[in-house]
């Protein structure tokens, strides 16, 4: 049976496509190719007589078409007008004609993409944006790349238009790309040039730093404000409510107690229009900022219950300093047969009983500093033991 | 089937007007040229008129120039043959044919040729 | 007076090979492909050679066509008794602009 092939099928712009012939009979007189889907005289492309190897072009021949011997027809320089059908007729010898209809399909060479935006410095949690990607071409595959990645899943991120536009619903700091778009067709594809979003945002609640809270008299005290903003904030420093000055970093140098206080860093954003604000209190103490470990001690480690009791003893070389008593991770005492005396450092129970058992541990703190003992573990039985006094921890 | 079928024949006086009719049938009538031949009485072929598939082109015998009008109406699949200034010597029995082929080379006649022919019909003129 | 010439008769036999020739000149002939028609007696005329010596569909391979400069003739072997009928060639002539036939041949078998 008669057929043709294009080749290729999906032709470029500008390109050349062949429409091949296979099949053909036997004792041919000649050859005629048309435009369409049917052997239509007003549509005749070429003529070819076997006989005296003569082409002659008909209505719809437009220069660029070749015919071979072979029945082939080859078209040069393509433009999306030839897209369609070929209808090839065959004139055999006895005049007992055949027909047959290829087709093709020319796609233009794409340009470079360029993508437009309806709002290139959105508002954070508040704008919505639209990007398009130009130009608007038929028969074309859009598709959009944030970070050199294809689209993540999200209901923030619609496509509409054929997927030509890419709209950002409520965007956030994160959204600043950069976004590509990608135009593609059977012949060729092409992307743009990356374009990112100006994302106006914050303030954020400021940040000050360091975290220290008590400083010595006679030190530098030197603070420093940050709040996420875009774009970067405005800072402003207050004590006790009182302004100070207009800089990211507040420095007093030679600090005595009356720098004590509450300091404020104030952030403001003039685009968004939003203002945020941090409150730190700054102590200036002789207290020491470090305290040292204390130890603890034991009067006897292996009670019996319900008749001995123990003394236990934190003890520090530091002073200004407050003791408190931990067991099995309860603040103590909790019952009456737990007492604190010498400002905390001796804990007393009397009696012991069975539930006293366990893990001990002292700390001592100051308003700037704390710092804990090891464990010490009581054991409380209720059969006769020899009692052994005056133990260290194990 | 591929048919041609003549009608419009008959009798007129010298001077008058006849317009022959020729339905097509079985084919793409618009592909195709067409023609009219006659025969007279007892005597050999005579070509008459011939019409391009798209009516661009028409042709006619140095016998019935000025006298004879050949058109089609593609969408009626039918050729016609206006006929006026009659004379006896055009009593014959008129044919419509179609050329077989499509235009092959630059000179598109060189082919001519028919290959289905109508019945005829008669066209008598007399008085 | 036809423009193309062929001779008023032919006779021929049952079996035997007769040739019909077609005179023309350079503007017809010489310029244009030969068509050679059958008509059987009562009937339209039927297409039996065109483009010279190409034979359409339902043509016995008995009929057979070929030119040389401004003549052609057609040669019908193994006549029949069913071949006897007028025959008539045929061809595009350029200075008339206008096509032309031969005055007919009557082919009789014997």
């Known amino acids: 049976q008669l057929t043709t092939e294009s080749m290729p099928f999906n032709v470029a712009e500008g390109k050349e496509v062949l429409l091949l012939v296979h099949n053909l009979p036997q004792q041919l007189f000649g050859y005629s190719w048309y435009k369409g889907e049917r052997v239509d005289g007003n549509r005749q492309i070429v003529g070819y007589a076997i006989g005296t190897q003569q082409a002659t072009p008909g209505p719809a021949n437009s220069g660029r078409e070749t015919i071979y011997p072979n029945a082939s027809l080859l078209i040069q320089n393509v433009t999306q007008n030839d897209t369609g059908f070929y209808t090839l007729q065959v004139i055999k010898s006895d005049l007992v004609n055949e027909e047959a209809t290829g087709q093709f399909h020319v796609y233009p060479e794409l340009p470079k993409p360029s993508i437009s935006s309806n709002n290139s410095n959105p508002v954070e949690d508040k704008d919505a944006v639209a990007f398009t990607c130009e130009p608007e071409t038929q028969d074309t595959t859009y598709l959009w790349w944030i970070n050199n990645q294809s689209l993540p899943v999200s209901p923030r991120l619609q496509l509409s238009n054929g997927n030509r536009t890419l709209t950002l619903l409520s965007v956030t700091r994160n959204d600043t790309g950069p976004y590509e778009c990608e135009i593609q067709n059977p012949v060729s594809a092409n992307r743009s040039d990356p374009v990112t979003l100006n994302v106006t945002y914050g303030p954020d609640t400021p940040t000050i730093s360091p975290s220290d809270t008590y400083y010595r008299p006679g030190a530098n005290l030197s603070l420093s404000c940050y709040a996420a903003s875009n774009p970067p904030a405005q800072y402003s420093w207050l004590i006790n409510g009182t302004f100070q000055q207009s800089t990211q970093e507040l420095f007093i140098p030679n600090i005595t107690v009356n720098n004590s206080g509450s300091y404020t860093c104030h952030a403001n954003n003039s685009v968004t229009g939003c203002n945020r604000t941090t409150v730190k209190t700054i102590i200036v103490t002789e207290l020491s900022p470090v305290v040292a470990k204390p130890q603890i001690k034991a009067s006897k480690t292996t009670v019996t219950g319900d008749k001995d009791s123990v003394n236990l003893t934190c003890s520090t070389n530091d002073t200004g300093i407050s003791i408190r008593w931990f067991f099995k991770n309860q603040s103590l005492p909790s019952s009456e047969r737990m007492k604190l005396s010498q400002g905390n450092t001796t804990l007393s129970i009397n009696p012991v009983k069975r539930e006293d058992a366990g893990t001990y541990w002292c700390e001592v703190f100051n308003p700037i500093s704390k710092n804990q003992s090891d464990p010490i573990m009581l054991n409380v039985n209720y059969n006769a033991l020899p009692q052994e006094n005056g133990l260290s921890p194990g | 089937e591929v048919q041609l079928l003549e009608s419009g024949g008959g009798l007129v006086q010298p001077g008058g007007s006849l317009r022959l009719s020729c339905a097509a049938s079985?084919?793409?009538?618009?592909?195709?040229?067409m023609s009219w031949v006659r025969q007279a009485p007892g005597k050999g072929l005579e070509w008459v008129s011939g019409?391009?598939?798209?009516?661009?082109?028409?042709y006619y015998a140095d016998s019935v120039k000025g006298r004879f009008t050949i058109s089609r109406d593609n969408s009626k699949n039918t050729l016609y043959l206006q006929m006026n200034s009659l004379r006896a010597e055009d009593t014959a029995v008129y044919y419509c044919?179609?050329?077989?082929?499509?235009?092959?080379?630059?000179?598109?006649?060189?082919?001519?040729?028919?290959?289905?022919w109508g019945q005829g019909t008669l066209v008598t003129v007399s008085s | 007076q036809s423009v193309l010439t062929q001779p008023p008769s032919a006779p021929g036999t049952p079996g035997q090979r007769v040739t019909i020739s077609c005179s023309g000149s350079?503007?017809?002939?010489?310029?244009?492909?030969v068509t050679w028609y059958q008509q059987l007696p009562g009937t339209a005329p039927k297409l039996l050679i065109y483009?010279?010596?190409h034979r359409p569909s339902g043509v016995p391979d008995r009929f057979s066509g070929s030119k040389s400069g401004t003549s052609a003739s057609l040669a019908i072997s193994g006549l029949r008794s069913e071949d006897e009928a007028d025959y008539y060639c045929?061809?595009?002539?350029?200075?008339?602009?206008?096509?032309?036939f031969g005055g007919g041949t009557k082919l009789t078998v014997l």
């Open positions: 044919a179609r050329d077989p082929l499509p235009c092959l080379i630059p000179k598109c006649s060189y082919y001519y040729a028919m290959d289905v």
């Open positions: 079985g084919f793409t009538f618009s592909n195709y040229d």
């Open positions: 019409i391009s598939h798209s009516s661009g082109s028409k």
């Open positions: 350079s503007s017809n002939i010489g310029s244009n492909a």
């Open positions: 483009a010279d010596s």
């Open positions: 045929g061809s595009w002539d350029d200075s008339l602009n206008a096509y032309v």
